[in-house]
């Protein structure tokens, strides 16, 4: 099932998935001056079965001749660097497809693709956070978020990560102000069924890849 919301935003951090579950959509977004062809695919879809998954549909961008009738707010360089979705300078392929059945790898870039990728994730997807360059991590727990199904609604767990500027004098991790979870309650208080498909396999992979997950993108 598709997750209702996007993963949580952590100030000065970006997130990344190591592999994408079947049913994940990647929107066909184009860089400035280009647009998705009118009758082209809206998104690529991770599809397949438990033994083999791949991305369906092709994204195609064409030169944008349409006049701009929207009021544009151009992000400042700092904002662009900290956009929450993965920036695709070089697509990372950390996981061999065979090692995560029912998952797709990072799809290759397409011509004139936008600088950030917009995914629609599905229940059970895990994403990993890292502070952007110039900020360091204060951990209180795992810097990851999982889309879970609780009481028939989807929600993302709150990653336990705070990114602080290198020059700032930071508090000890124990003194940090806790970041409010959207639900405002710890998971232990919920007693109904939580869908946890594929968490374990991804967590195990995370343990071996945690140190190298972002190296190809943020050097």
């Amino acid at each position: 099932e598709l997750c209702d919301d996007d993963p949580p935003e952590i100030p000065h951090a970006t997130f990344k998935a190591m592999a994408y579950k079947e049913g994940t959509m990647l929107n066909c977004e184009c860089k400035r001056g280009f647009r998705r062809i009118k009758s082209g695919s809206l998104y690529m879809l991770c599809t397949g079965n438990s033994s083999h998954s791949s991305w369906d549909n092709q994204c195609q961008c064409t030169s944008s001749a349409t006049r701009n009738t929207t009021k544009q707010v151009t992000p400042q360089p700092e904002e662009q660097k900290e956009r929450k979705t993965t920036e695709m300078q070089s697509p990372m392929q950390p996981v061999d497809q065979a090692s995560l059945p029912g998952h797709c790898r990072e799809p290759p870039p397409w011509e004139n693709e936008a600088t950030e990728r917009i995914y629609h994730f599905v229940v059970g997807q895990m994403v990993y956070y890292q502070c952007v360059q110039g900020y360091r991590a204060l951990h209180r727990g795992p810097a990851e978020s999982v889309c879970k199904m609780t009481h028939g609604k989807t929600r993302w767990t709150q990653p336990q990560l705070i990114c602080t500027g290198e020059m700032e004098t930071s508090q000890f991790p124990g003194e940090e102000k806790p970041q409010a979870s959207p639900e405002g309650r710890p998971e232990s208080e919920t007693s109904c069924l939580v869908t946890t498909t594929d968490f374990q396999i991804q967590t195990e992979m995370a343990a071996t890849m945690e140190t190298s997950i972002f190296t190809t993108e943020y050097q």
Epitope: N27, T47, S64, N68, T70, I118
Partner: antibody, heavy 114, light 107 residues
Framework: QVQLQQSGAELVRPGTSVKMSCKAA????????IGWVKQRPGHGLEWIGD????????DYNEKFTGKATLTADTSSSTAYMQLSSLTSEDSAIYYC???????WGQGTLVTVSA | DVVMTQSQKFMSTSVGDRVSVTCKAS??????VAWYQQKPGQSPKALIY???YRYSGVPDRFTGSGSGTDFTLTISNVQSEDLAEYFC?????????FGGGTKLEIK
């Protein structure tokens, strides 16, 4: 929570125009196109067009070219649709839709009557 | 434009039954098909995307299938709250088009 909140019902005169709004909340407005759909009893659902607030481009169903004008204001995360030269054929419920069809607004009822 | 045909305007079923709503496209649309449920006085609710994938909060008794030109929405173990109109939509080519709808009546 992702929401699309549409403006209230409109009773308008033939020949005039009307502008309705769709305010997005709970997601990054500039990341997703917003589409508009017309529903009239006995005529089903019709796609009017869509606008990408981030990319700034707009597509119209040819049937609605000249009838509908789509705009968006990124500062208020609001999309707008203006309908001009209204006739009784334009009496309908109009929906905005976003996030790859997953989210629909509650609809705006437009009644064209003298 | 691609024409989406839902040949059955009305379907009658009983609670606990299994029912299939069909939709035929006038040309190949791949799997770029969505299904919606609309209850009286409400806006359409997205059920299925890419012909067979469920949106969040959609009970697993709703399943979509098909590709190319023939598509089916199956509701197994029909519940009284499934009383609604069901629409298919193609988004393979512009303008995106909808089927005329199938009203599900509960006996």
């Amino acid at each position: 929570q992702v929401q699309l909140q549409q403006s209230g019902a409109e009773l308008v005169r033939p020949g005039t125009s009307v502008k309705m709004s769709c305010k997005a909340a709970g997601y990054t407005f500039t990341n997703y196109w917003i589409g508009w759909v017309k529903q009239r009893p006995g005529h089903g659902l019709e796609w009017i067009g869509d606008i990408h607030p981030g990319g700034g481009y707009i597509d119209y169903n040819e049937k609605f070219t000249g009838k509908a004008t789509l705009t968006a204001d990124t500062s208020s995360s609001t999309a707008y649709m203006q309908l001009s030269s209204l006739t009784s054929e334009d009496s309908a419920i109009y929906y905005c839709v976003s996030r790859n069809f997953a989210k629909w607004g509650q609809g705006t009822l437009v009644t064209v009557s003298a | 434009d691609v024409v989406m045909t839902q040949s059955q305007k009305f379907m009658s079923t009983s609670v606990g039954d299994r029912v299939s709503v069909t939709c035929k496209a006038s040309q190949n649309v791949g799997t770029n098909v969505a299904w919606y449920q609309q209850k009286p006085g409400q806006s359409p609710k997205a059920l299925i995307y890419s012909a067979s994938y469920r949106y969040s909060g959609v009970p697993d008794r709703f399943t979509g299938s098909g590709s190319g030109t023939d598509f089916t929405l199956t509701i197994s173990n029909v519940q009284s709250e499934d009383l609604a109109e069901y629409f298919c939509q193609q988004y393979n080519s512009y303008p995106y088009t909808f089927g005329g709808g199938t009203k599900l009546e509960i006996k």
